[in-house]
């Protein structure tokens, strides 16, 4: 069920329409639900979730991560800088979410839902941001070659990459959710 269309909202007609912040909050929680389902399949299928060899694969990936300089942490919190980081990070994750498509058997629709919901989340956040010029969009050519490279990996590395993308994306969304609720 897409965010904003659950039975709770239908059963409460007196409820005010969702604010922009509430819509974003709900959207992130919806994506986190999807990631949770995908992680279940990944962890059931292989022992990647317990593996200590993550560092080997992590070197090949440049997954977005929150750092103190991004303005999303309480010390040095900066709403606009943080918002730019969140949007930029989500745009950078898009190529990795594309990679996740066709990586799941029983959760194929869920993988697509995570990808599409992330696009919607980016749109919501872009409406909220004042300084859209500061947002750098990843280069399509670079993304295409990265995708080819990732898809050419052996099976073990592909499984590990899938696990790392899901874990990192979850962490990035949680950091974003925390920061957005402080805004």
């Amino acid at each position: 069920v897409p965010p904003g269309e659950d039975s709770k909202d239908v059963a409460a007609p007196h409820r005010q329409p969702l604010t922009s912040s509430e819509r974003i909050d709900k959207q992130i929680r919806y994506i986190l639900d999807g990631i949770s389902a995908l992680r279940k399949e990944t962890c059931n299928k292989s022992n990647m979730c317990e593996s200590s060899k993550e560092a080997l694969a992590e070197n090949n990936l440049n997954l977005p991560k929150m750092a103190e300089k991004d303005g999303c942490f309480q010390s040095g919190f900066n709403e606009e800088t943080c918002l730019v980081k969140i949007i930029t990070g989500l745009l950078e994750f898009e190529v990795y979410l594309e990679y996740l498509q066709n990586r799941f058997e029983s959760s194929e629709e869920q993988a697509r839902a995570v990808q599409m919901s992330t696009k919607v989340l980016i749109q919501f956040l872009q409406k909220k941001a004042k300084n859209l010029d500061a947002i750098t969009t990843p280069d399509p050519t670079t993304n295409a070659s990265l995708l080819t490279k990732l898809q050419a990996q052996n099976q073990w590395l592909q499984d590990m990459t899938t696990h790392l993308i899901l874990r990192s994306f979850k962490e990035f969304l949680q950091s974003s959710l925390r920061a957005l609720r402080q805004m």
């Epitope: 929680r29 949770s36 929150m66 942490f73 874990r167 962490e171 949680q174 959710l177 925390r178 609720r181």
Partner: antibody, heavy 119, light 106 residues
Framework: QVTLKESGPTLVKPTQTLTLTCSFS??????????VGWVRQPPGKALEWLAF???????YYSPSLESRLTITKDTSKNQVVLTMTNMDPVDTATYYC??????????????WGQGTLVT | DIQMTQSPSSLSAFVGDGVTMTCWAS??????LNWYHQRPGEAPELLVF???NLQIGVPSRFRGSGSETYFTLTINSLQPEDSGTYFC?????????FGGGTKLEI
């Protein structure tokens, strides 16, 4: 099984610094979505949130006490330390550490230590 | 800061009765509201998170509801062990704040 335990002095003189340690087991403070907070309760009064530290070292403090508080973590030792400077008799309370751990960051404390009474 | 107000401050009831206590937030907190139970001399215990989700192991006699600024905790078929103080806490953003508590006497 998740457990937390507070340790530190039971008696502190005015103007001194209080250092409390929260030792925990059954979870890792390097897992995303996990955090540890400190809450105190003066005798017969309500709960008061003091400080919080997240898996990624993001830290939050109660605005009224921020200048006196410092929270740190040692992930390898499974410990969180709270220091409170310039102690005063009004700071007499039971000090609790508690864990927050859920995917959606509801900031709910699902497991608490037994508490330590500081006078 | 978001202020949390609980009502009533105390109430008494008999075993088997049902009671409802309320918690108000000074601004909308969506569904980021948690309820705790504390017995004298013990640490608080999480009962309900995210306004209506029962924590694992909590009996179904407990029910949380509400959203935005108004929340309730209902306890049906009261048991002797339900006595103590109930606190609400918002989990919307930092700083976190607790309500003043509702003391329940059975």
């Amino acid at each position: 099984q998740v457990t937390l335990k507070e340790s530190g002095p039971t008696l502190v003189k005015p103007t001194q610094t209080l250092t409390l340690t929260c030792s925990f087991s059954g979870f890792s403070l390097s897992t995303s979505g996990v955090g540890v907070g400190w809450v105190r309760q003066p005798p017969g009064k309500a709960l008061e949130w003091l400080a919080f530290i997240w898996w990624d070292d993001d830290k939050y403090y109660s605005p009224s006490l921020e200048s006196r508080l410092t929270i740190t973590k040692d992930t390898s030792k499974n410990q969180v330390v709270l220091t409170m400077t310039n102690m005063d008799p009004v700071d007499t309370a039971t000090y609790y550490c508690a864990r927050s751990a859920d995917d959606y960051l509801y900031y709910s404390f699902d497991t608490w230590g037994q508490g330590t009474l500081v006078t | 800061d978001i202020q949390m107000t609980q009502s009533p401050s105390s109430l008494s009831a008999f075993v088997g009765d049902g009671v409802t206590m309320t918690c108000w937030a000074s601004q909308s907190i969506n569904d980021y509201l948690n309820w705790y139970h504390q017995r004298p001399g013990e640490a608080p215990e999480l009962l309900v998170f995210a306004a209506s989700n029962l924590q694992i192991g909590v009996p179904s006699r407990f029910r949380g509801s509400g959203s935005e600024t108004y929340f309730t905790l209902t306890i049906n078929s009261l048991q002797p062990e339900d006595s103590g103080t109930y606190f609400c806490q918002h989990g919307h953003s930092f700083p976190l704040t607790f309500g003043g508590g509702t003391k329940l006497e059975i």
